[in-house]
């Protein structure tokens, strides 16, 4: 059986202030069933950035239907991009259980902010 | 216990439009996805339209895409369909049924409710 | 749409059977229980096996490969009726089956 591959087709994305940022993740199986988080930078201290199951985040929406049978599309939109958002992204499959556990993190996607053109 | 109430049907005229509402409670409206499914006189089921549970993505069946809206207020704890350009094959008991916690519009393998259905007959 | 026999049927006190196929890759299927042309549906499995509270045990569903299966033990003359599975295809379409009659002899 092929191993599950956690897709970030960009390894960075480039982002004027006040705008909005989308960060592509794919999975390539829909096996084993667990969710999909985002987060921002890695190890320990990494900042969960989007979780479908639970937590408010109201400048993250998914880009597909999360709740789909069969999607496989969990990339994100951030709205209303500031300099503090900076950073690594990544995409992480986890297997359900009780707790989850991690399985495959996406290699990540550095998102920079510009300047507002003004 | 849950229970799904649709309004709207009745006797329609061919070309013209009907809104029908489905108005959901003894459940956490705003948590499950929503779908209308119809049966045509002496026919099968068919699935018509279906909507996420935050109302951000909406699905739509072959005979019906284009036009149809369904949308939904999950602070009144309903769904509505709308169906232009209304056509005889259209004649059917419309069906609003709940997912029960899992899938999205067009999973129908998670339909776990069906309301009563209500009737609409296209005719002139 | 799903492939599902037309017709089965059972002396009372029987298992039987109704099998669904065609859905898309890895979904699932549910069954839906219709007494009488025009009125409401029922379901009896969801999610390929689970049973919603009010539904007897004797209804089990379960899904192997592609196929999904609803299974009735100890069939009763009210099960007779006309099931329908659903579920989605590979576009995220919904589909039904055409319906499979049971037919409880004797």
């Known amino acids: 059986e092929e191993e599950l591959q956690v897709i970030q087709p960009e390894k960075s994305v480039s982002v004027a202030a006040g705008d909005s940022a989308t960060l592509n993740c794919t999975v390539s199986s829909l096996i084993p069933v667990g969710p999909i988080q985002w987060f921002r930078g890695a190890g320990p201290g990494r900042e969960l950035i989007y979780n479908l199951k639970e937590g408010h985040f109201p400048r993250v929406t998914a880009v597909s239907d999360p709740t789909k049978r069969n999607n496989m599309d969990f990339s994100i939109r951030i709205s209303n991009i500031t300099p503090a958002d900076a950073g690594t992204y990544y995409c992480v499959k986890f297997r359900k259980g009780s707790p989850d556990v991690e399985l495959k993190s996406g290699a990540g996607t550095e998102l920079s902010v510009r300047a507002k053109p003004s | 216990a849950v229970t799904l109430d649709e309004s709207g049907g009745g006797l329609q005229t061919p070309g013209g439009a009907l809104s029908l509402v489905c108005k959901g409670s003894?459940?956490?409206?705003?948590?499950?996805?929503m779908n209308w499914v119809r049966q045509a006189p002496g026919k099968g089921l068919e699935w018509v339209a279906g909507?996420?549970?935050?109302?951000?993505?909406?699905y739509y069946g072959a005979a019906v895409q284009g036009r149809a809206t369904i949308s939904r207020d999950n602070g009144q704890s309903t769904v509505r369909l709308q169906l232009n350009n209304l056509r005889a094959e259209d004649t059917a008991t419309y069906y609003c049924?709940?997912?029960?916690?899992?899938?999205?519009?067009?999973?129908?393998?998670?339909?776990?409710?069906w309301g009563h259905g209500t009737e609409v007959i296209v005719s002139s | 749409a799903l492939t599902q026999p037309a017709s089965v049927s059972a002396n009372p006190g029987e298992t039987v059977e109704i099998t669904c196929s065609g859905g898309?890759?890895?979904?699932?299927y549910g069954w839906f229980q219709q007494k009488s042309p025009g009125s409401a549906p029922l379901t009896v499995i969801?999610?390929?096996?689970k049973r919603p509270s009010d539904i007897p045990s004797r209804f089990s569903g379960s899904k192997s490969d592609s196929t999904g299966t609803l299974t009735i033990t100890r069939v009763q003359a009210e099960d007779e009726a006309v099931y329908y599975c659903?579920?989605?295809?590979?576009?995220?379409?919904?589909?039904f089956g055409a319906g499979t009659t049971l037919t409880v002899l004797g």
């Open positions: 049924t709940k997912n029960g916690g899992c899938g999205s519009g067009g999973d129908l393998d998670c339909i776990d409710a």
């Open positions: 003894g459940f956490t409206f705003s948590s499950h996805a």
């Open positions: 909507i996420s549970s935050d109302g951000r993505f909406t």
């Open positions: 898309g890759s890895n979904n699932a």
């Open positions: 969801y999610d390929n096996g």
């Open positions: 659903g579920s989605a295809d590979n576009s995220g379409a919904g589909v």
